[in-house]
């Protein structure tokens, strides 16, 4: 069968029909149901919300939608002994606590079952001492204290900003700096915009407000119990003493009152510079310990969460493909929530809903795509994107054969100034093509295209005319399908103007004051902004499953792989005498990467040339584009990350939202010149160049004439 | 559709001991818990304690500990609860419910039809 | 543990009534409260979770509110399956405990 016989309606019509059945009204609604209760993992009230999704997936027109489920390590606070803070004097006696739960927002004060803030995993503990302020508790931060300041931050408490870089990676710094305890809290300088009013009258996070999170080193692993297999009931489960990436000191986030409170009294030396000042009225002293009339004082932390054994359950509906339904584009975001969900995930889920009734509408007028998609309502994305990685897992077999495309679908929205991508180069053209046909919802822009708004306010920082499109790191669930199986990914949601805070989230992220009235009131009233992401998301699938040639360009690749290549060269060159002395040279990956620009330029003249009706070197040279990216995958994964095998991008080693391009070189050549043997180091620079080159070059040669 | 159908009624003496089944059907039995009610003629509704075959976890009104033993046969997808040392003030009929298992949750959904327990010597 | 205190413990009414019966939390348990309902034969069936969202099958004409720490349930209009007793169940925290019951007779 042709496409266009199997699926009665032209090609064009299909899509223009699928993206004017989208719709801002029905988003806003599903939105508000989908935010009127929490919907933490875990619990009744998210296993009730998949069923009902489960429920309308069905009536959207779905040909089948089921539930999988898990057996996955959580982690909660004890319901009767909470997690608090105190600050104790020389006798013991707690002078000062810090509050056990937000003030809820309006209309919400008789909610039950909003979890307290906490930070997941953390193990339970009592610890006290003296704290030692680490800024945001990078790994430069460290740095700063350890070698310029010295300052021993081994059995104290640390307490540092969130922001910059992702929570667990501030966790794990601390621990191996020696702390025996770790305080997050939000400064206002990352969390209180400007201007704006804080929440209920405005988008800023007030004093009391607070943000949960996992502090997890997953490193890709999933449920940390069952690493690299799905959690079933037939499941072997690692000892807790065993389980992958679990914290070793007890953890607790705190909100800017409560920090004051703390930060007031802090003595020691005072901050190196302007860069470690929040917007506290405190000096910002680093410590350790409190000033003169304080140093008698402690910190002590009061942690008895607990982590539990708990049922997960995602939500896979599936339309099957008319012509290839052994091919697969997935479309997937999480449910689960902290609290109510209003920005992550339900902004996302809401957009992923109304996909799914416009796809399903489209279906019962008697139209299928080409290829299956698969559509996924994730559980246990805030305890380390579990959901999807155990099913990832437990459907690799297929998933490494049949994926074609993951799209992911959590928030839509982390700002209303422009749109955000981050995906493959493969789907650059794809994204390009897609928002030149799109009206931009931004005001200013009206008549014109959201590739001119995006272009506009986003602009490429190496090509002048195109938009930014940013590498994927991790924090979300198409971690397993790109990190780990080598599925071409994406992501787009609408941003901020506010590129110096790209990894903090927005003021209210993971707190209380999440809720459905933050969108309505402050964010998208109209909900354009949701629809315009609706249509970006929805059309990537549309056309990944339907386009008859894969909307891949591996010329692009190509680009990257050279600008990524003369990066790294450029870092390793900072030692040009070891460099030397050790034979470290580059030529065999510039040489790989000149091969596969010239093979991929050669199979895009075929890809514009052969006979597309013959289904057969059709079907061959779309495996060619959809395995390329699975041939970017080193089955031994990188070192210390078996679940990170992609060779060009990984997740940064000190931010995990962050994505670092030949991560296996850059690792073996960061902080190198401290190294206590040179030349075992610079040898593991010569193999990750090595790994590197040769995995460039037999990605090439998937592209060549295959006889 | 959601049973819970608990075995036929039970006459005992003065420190025997009964034990009540409940087996369920309709869902996934791993997934909920078992929670055990009991109501003495006349009386209002008393909650004994539940159970979560998953995890194996049992918790029990203080009331009844050490007299009542809760456990779950997950092949038969069945709950059971065990009294001992009954007293006249045993007598009851004696209900179990369905409760998801999961840190928060709705408590009882579904409900057995019951089962009396007459301790008369 | 936490008392939930029952009113009325009874009451008559007429097919087409307005009904209310109110429960009195002794501490705070949010909305973590369930009506039920027990029909002479013993059967017991919940109407009502947490504090007022309704049970799949049923009638609209069951509601549940709050206020503070009193609870109510309330029956729009009184239909003749509606005789039975009902109770309040509290799951905020264990043990769980129910009200004494509302024993709705007919007038």
């Known amino acids: 069968k042709s496409s266009n016989e199997a699926t009665n309606i032209t090609p064009k019509h299909n899509m223009k029909a699928f993206l004017d059945e989208l719709k801002a009204e029905n988003i806003k609604k599903f939105l508000y149901n989908f935010t009127q209760i929490p919907h933490l993992a875990g619990t009744e009230q998210n296993f009730q919300l998949a069923k009902q999704i489960q429920s309308q997936w069905k009536e959207f027109g779905l040909d089948s939608v089921e539930l999988a489920h898990y057996d996955v390590l959580l982690s909660y606070p004890n319901k009767t002994h909470p997690n608090y803070i105190s600050i104790i004097n020389e006798d013991g006696n707690e002078i000062f606590n810090t509050s056990l739960f937000e003030p809820p927002p309006p209309g919400y004060e008789n909610v039950s079952d909003i979890v307290p803030p906490f930070s997941a995993f953390s193990p339970q503990g009592m610890p006290e001492g003296d704290l030692v302020y680490v800024n945001y508790a990078r790994t430069e931060d460290f740095f700063k204290l350890e070698r310029d300041m010295k300052i021993n931050c081994s059995g104290k408490i640390v307490i540092a900003r969130y922001g910059k870089v992702f929570r667990g990676n501030k966790v794990k710094n601390a621990q191996l700096a020696g702390a025996k305890g770790v305080i997050l809290y939000s400064d206002p300088a990352d969390y209180f915009a400007p201007g704006v009013k804080s929440y209920p009258d405005g988008w800023n996070l007030p004093g009391g407000g607070v943000q949960r999170g996992n502090i997890l080193n997953l490193n890709g692993a999933g449920d940390p119990l069952t690493p690299g297999y799905p959690a079933n009931e037939y499941a072997y489960r690692r000892g807790i003493a065993e389980a992958v990436g679990l914290p070793s000191i007890p953890v607790h986030p705190i909100g800017y009152y409560d920090a004051q409170k703390l930060l007031e009294k802090m003595g020691g030396s005072a901050p190196p510079d302007s860069s470690w000042r929040g917007s506290l009225k405190v000096p910002y002293n680093v410590g350790p310990g409190f000033t003169g009339n304080f140093s008698t004082q402690k910190v002590k932390m009061h942690i008895h969460s607990t982590n539990e054994v708990t049922r997960i359950y995602n939500v896979i509906g599936t339309l099957r493909g008319a012509v290839e339904p052994d091919r697969y584009v997935i479309l997937g975001g999480h449910r689960d929530s902290w609290v109510f969900g209003g920005i992550d995930p339900q902004s996302g889920a809401a957009v992923v809903h109304e996909i799914v009734r416009s796809f399903g509408t489209l279906k019962k007028e008697g139209w299928r795509p080409r290829r299956t998609i698969l559509f996924a309502s994730w559980d246990a994305e805030e305890f380390g994107l579990l959901g999807s990685t155990e099913w990832a897992e437990e459907n690799s077999r297929l998933l490494q054969e049949r994926g074609v495309a993951y799209i992911n679908a959590d928030s839509s929205i982390e700002g209303n100034y422009t749109l955000r991508v981050d995906c493959t180069p493969l789907m650059y053209s794809l994204v390009h093509n897609l928002t030149k046909e799109l009206k931009s919802p931004d005001e200013g822009f009206e008549g014109k295209s959201l590739y001119e708004s995006w272009t506009k306010k986003s602009p490429s920082p190496e090509f002048s005319g195109m938009p930014r499109i940013s590498k994927l790191g991790s924090g979300n669930d198409f971690e397993v399908f790109f990190q780990r199986l080598g599925i071409a990914s994406g992501r787009a949601r609408y941003t901020k103007n506010w590129e110096t805070n790209k990894f903090s989230g927005y003021p209210l992220y993971h707190s209380v004051y999440e809720t459905y009235e933050l969108v309505e009131k402050f964010y998208d009233p109209m909900f354009k902004y949701h629809l315009t992401v609706a249509q970006v998301r929805g059309g990537m699938v549309f056309e990944l499953a339907n386009s008859i040639v894969l909307p891949f360009d591996c010329r692009d690749y190509a680009v990257v792989l050279r600008k990524y290549a003369d990066k790294i060269y450029s870092i390793s060159m900072k030692h040009p005498q070891e460099m030397k002395t050790y034979s470290v040279s580059f030529d065999s990956l510039f040489s790989a990467v000149k091969n596969f620009t010239e093979i991929a330029s050669k199979f895009s003249e075929r890809l514009q040339d052969f006979d597309k009706s013959n289904p057969i070197v059709l079907r061959m040279m779309n495996d060619q584009l959809m395995f390329l990216e699975r041939a970017f995958i080193d089955p031994l994964g990188l070192p210390d990350r078996p679940f990170y095998r992609h060779v060009i991008y990984a997740p940064s080693s000190h931010n995990k939202y962050a994505g670092e391009s030949f991560p296996g070189i850059y690792d073996a050549l960061f902080d190198i010149e401290s190294k206590v043997d040179p030349s075992k180091a610079w040898g593991e620079v010569k193999r990750q160049i090595y790994v590197a080159a040769f995995t460039v070059q037999a990605a090439a040669e998937t592209l060549s004439e295959v006889a | 559709e959601v049973q819970l159908v608990q075995s036929g009624a039970e006459v005992k003496k003065p420190g025997a001991s009964v034990k009540v089944s409940c087996k369920a059907s309709g869902y996934t039995f791993t997934s909920y818990g078992i929670s055990w009610v009991r109501q003495a003629p006349g009386q209002g509704l008393e909650w004994m304690g539940e159970?979560?075959?998953?995890?194996?976890?049992?918790y029990y009104n203080e009331k009844f500990r050490g007299r009542v033993t809760l456990t779950a046969d997950k092949s038969t997808s069945t709950a059971y609860m065990e009294l001992r040392s009954l007293r006249s003030d045993d007598t009851a009929v004696y209900y179990c419910a369905r409760v998801f298992d999961g840190y928060y949750n709705y408590a009882m959904d579904y409900w057995g039809q019951g089962t009396t327990v007459t301790v008369s010597s | 543990d936490i008392q939930m205190t029952q009113s009325p413990s009874s009451l008559s009414a007429s097919v087409g009534d307005r009904v209310t019966i109110t429960c009195r939390a002794s501490q705070d348990i949010g909305s973590s409260l369930n009506w039920l309902q027990q029909k002479p034969g013993g059967a017991i069936k919940r109407l009502i979770y947490a504090t007022s969202s309704l049970d799949s099958g049923v009638p609209s004409r069951f509601s549940g509110s709050r206020s503070g720490s009193d609870y109510t349930l309330t029956i729009s209009s009184l239909q003749p399956e509606d005789f039975a007793t009902y109770y309040c169940l509290q799951y905020a925290s264990s043990p769980y405990t129910f009200g004494g019951g509302t024993k709705v007779e007919i007038k």
């Open positions: 159970i979560f075959p998953r995890r194996g976890n049992t």
